[in-house]
């Protein structure tokens, strides 16, 4: 129930990548505004994005306080220009979001190959350890800091001159692979969290090939 000139938000959806987390909803407001609240299962509600005409709210600052907690959000609808107005039950109209556990559900962002270095018949490929907005002791943590050994990278690599791919995996951010001397290789990586059941894999990184700027060659 609610006042006749407000409608409840619907299609509340969490959009989250590497812990950058935004709640989205519908509809686009007509003569109404929204306020969002978020809490953990056992915590108090905290209001965000007060009386906004947006249909999204950045909740990153709240969820990064403890990414292993499960969060619930709700979106309140108020008549524009009369935000004190309540529904017939004496409170504003609102809709609950699905539950969201950042550690288990945030999408893994597209990784980036930071560098590769060839020494003889070995190549060391390094994946950039992306910074997140999760903090510890006033420092922003990297993806590896947050996930530890739960995060692995799969490397795809192939000779520039052929299509046959090989693969390797690492639970650090470095691969050391064997290559044929005198051959150029291309590389792509993918992030995976094996223990997950949803949002397990990232998209593949951009392809990087030897003979381009990121590489280094030593005899």
């Amino acid at each position: 129930s609610g006042t006749t000139n407000t409608v409840a938000a619907y299609n509340l959806t969490w959009k989250s990548t590497n812990f950058k987390t935004i709640l989205e909803w519908e509809p686009k407001p007509v003569n109404q505004v929204y306020t969002v609240q978020i809490s953990t299962k056992s915590g108090d509600w905290k209001s965000k994005c007060f009386y906004t005409t947006d249909t999204e709210c950045d909740l990153t600052d709240e969820i990064v306080k403890d990414v292993k907690q499960t969060y619930l959000a709700r979106v309140f609808s108020y008549p524009a220009g009369n935000v004190e107005s309540t529904g017939s039950a004496g409170e504003p109209l609102y809709e609950n979001s699905p539950e969201f556990t950042p550690y288990l559900e945030t999408n893994l962002g597209q990784p980036t190959i930071q560098s590769f270095e060839q020494v003889g018949t070995k190549v060391n490929v390094t994946v950039e350890d992306e910074r997140t907005l999760v903090r510890r002791n006033n420092t922003f943590l990297s993806l590896r800091d947050v996930f530890g050994k739960d995060l692995i990278y799969t490397l795809y690599y192939w000779k520039s001159s052929s299509s046959g791919k090989k693969t390797a995996k690492t639970n650090t951010n470095e691969f050391l692979i064997d290559v044929d001397k005198g051959e150029n290789y291309c590389f792509s990586v993918q992030a995976v969290i094996p223990s997950r059941t949803v949002n397990r894999k990232s998209t593949d990184s951009p392809v990087e090939c030897m003979g381009q700027e990121k590489g280094e060659f030593r005899e």
């Epitope: 791919k165 995996k169 995976v192 094996p194 059941t197």
Partner: antibody, heavy 117, light 107 residues
């Protein structure tokens, strides 16, 4: 419940072709890597190759690269193994398996391929 | 390619025995090794992953150890249902390779 069901095995003449299917249920194959592993009668397990159904990346044991092709149809939640130029030594039970990227946690029951004239 | 040498190829043991199977990689595979049990006419079943982690639902009498090139599967007290063939698998890099298998038979 997670399930993998292989089909398409049977008797084929040397030089012939066969396409095996691995129908998955209880999960979405694009979230995992899918492998094919074979086992000749009375012998050990032999890895054939894998596919990442989400992007189509395939990896093969080089000995199978020229004759075998792994593919997937995410709309059907099914992985495939296309085998060409079959030889008597390809006679085996062929298994598909789901890979979490840490281990193969579910396997199909296997389908027998017999190559004989 | 990485070769996995598994030993012994077969062994005879009695219920209650402690059984040890080893797998040796031709070069460093860190901890990218898993162990599988296979019974006749059945698909393999995961026992151990990352060399030492026990898979869900697997009895605690099974354990894995090792890293680098040398790995061990131990059954602390063999049970009747443990008579089967055991395989190691390195999945750190392609081509993935299995050991030749160890058949555990009743003495």
């Amino acid at each position: 419940e997670v399930q993998l069901v292989e089909s398409g095995g049977g008797l084929v003449q040397p030089g012939g072709s066969l396409r095996l299917s691995c129908a998955a249920s209880g999960f979405n194959i694009k979230d995992y890597y899918m492998h094919w592993v074979r086992q000749a009668p009375g012998k050990g397990l032999e890895w054939v190759g894998w596919i990442d159904p989400e992007n189509g990346n395939t990896i093969y044991d080089p000995k199978f690269q020229d004759r075998f092709t792994i593919s997937a149809d995410t709309s059907k939640n099914t992985a495939y193994l296309q085998m060409n130029s079959l030889r008597a030594e390809d006679t085996a039970v062929y298994y598909c398996a789901r890979d979490t990227a840490a281990y193969f946690d579910y396997w199909g029951q296997g389908t027998l391929v017999t190559v004989s004239s | 390619d990485i070769q996995m040498t598994q030993s012994p190829s077969s062994l005879s043991a009695s219920v209650g025995d402690r059984v040890t199977i080893t797998c040796k990689a031709s070069r460093d595979i860190k901890s990218y090794l898993s162990w599988y049990q296979q019974k006749p006419g059945k698909a393999p079943k995961l026992l151990i992953y990352y060399a030492t982690s026990l898979a869900d639902g697997v009895p605690s009498r099974f354990s894995g150890s090792g890293s680098g090139t040398d790995f061990t599967l131990t059954i602390s007290s063999l049970q009747p249902e443990d008579f089967a063939t055991y395989y190691c698998l390195q999945d750190g890099e392609s081509p993935f390779t299995f050991g030749q298998g160890t058949k555990v038979e009743i003495k």
